[in-house]
């Protein structure tokens, strides 16, 4: 049973509005119809789940309403966007992909994308 390869960019810089996007691509060993994608964050010797979505191939990813993640899928690629990021959210964001159905179950975990978030400088008060 070969480990499923998951590829993601090494580094991404969040926008000044605190939005970061990256592609998570997986090499599917079979014809999966149900896929689960989870974004993990590793920082300060702790791993936490940022968001997760299960989708049927060909359909949109559906994250929970209060999720900071959105995404779209195209074949074996998932385009992930994380919003509301601040400097304290800088860390390694890891893409975990599970092929849920049909059996057999496959799991792949990427090497992670280091997302750097820089809080914007507050605008100086203007006299005008």
């Amino acid at each position: 049973c070969k480990a499923m390869h998951v590829a993601q960019p090494a580094v991404v810089l969040a926008s000044s509005r605190g939005i970061a996007s990256f592609v998570c691509e997986y090499a599917s060993p079979g014809k999966a119809t149900e896929v689960r994608v989870t974004v993990l964050r590793q920082a300060d010797s702790q791993v936490t789940e940022v968001c997760a979505a299960t989708y049927m191939m060909g359909n949109e990813l559906t994250f929970l309403d209060d999720s900071i993640c959105t995404g779209t899928s195209s074949g074996n690629q998932v385009n992930l966007t994380i919003q509301g990021l601040r400097a304290m959210d800088t860390g390694l964001y890891i893409c975990k992909v599970e092929l849920m159905y049909p059996p057999p179950y496959y799991l792949g975990i990427g090497n992670g994308t280091q997302i750097y978030v820089i809080d914007p400088e507050p605008c100086p008060d203007s006299d005008f």
Epitope: K2, Q46, I109
Partner: nanobody, 129 residues
């Protein structure tokens, strides 16, 4: 499909020894293998891991007392536990993760179970004083 089946465990007096075994099938040699433990109301913690090149890592709480090893011929993972203490009492789980990159750091990382998607059924270890 990776499958893990544990054996071993049981009850022992403090200072005693136990060996846990975990037979792995469908296992691919780029996996990270490890042992976790969990007590009621607490999260699973990584006790020991072994990488594809045979390099091992241990949680500080078991260093010098526990030894993880993998027998390639038998496709079996072992955890030799010596000088057991009452605080080692827990449910022990054998696990496999698909990315060795996270192997060595797992023992010092909270939430490291996220990296290990394949789990055995668990075996109880009870150490009495």
């Amino acid at each position: 499909q990776v499958q893990l089946v544990e054996s071993g465990g049981g009850s022992v007096q403090a200072g005693g020894s136990l060996r846990l075994s975990c037979a792995a099938s469908g296992y691919y040699n780029r996996y990270c293998l490890g042992w976790f433990r969990q007590t009621p109301g607490k999260e699973r913690e990584a006790v020991a891991t072994i990488d594809t090149d045979g390099s091992t890592s241990y949680a500080d709480s078991v260093k010098g007392r526990f030894t993880i090893s993998f027998d390639n011929a038998k496709n079996t993972l072992y955890l030799q536990m010596n000088s057991l203490k009452p605080e080692d009492t827990a449910m022990y789980y054998c696990a496999a993760g698909p990315n060795p990159r996270y192997c060595s750091g797992a023992v010092n990382t909270r939430g490291a179970e996220h990296y290990f998607g394949y789990w055995a059924q668990g075996t109880q270890v009870t150490v009495s004083s």
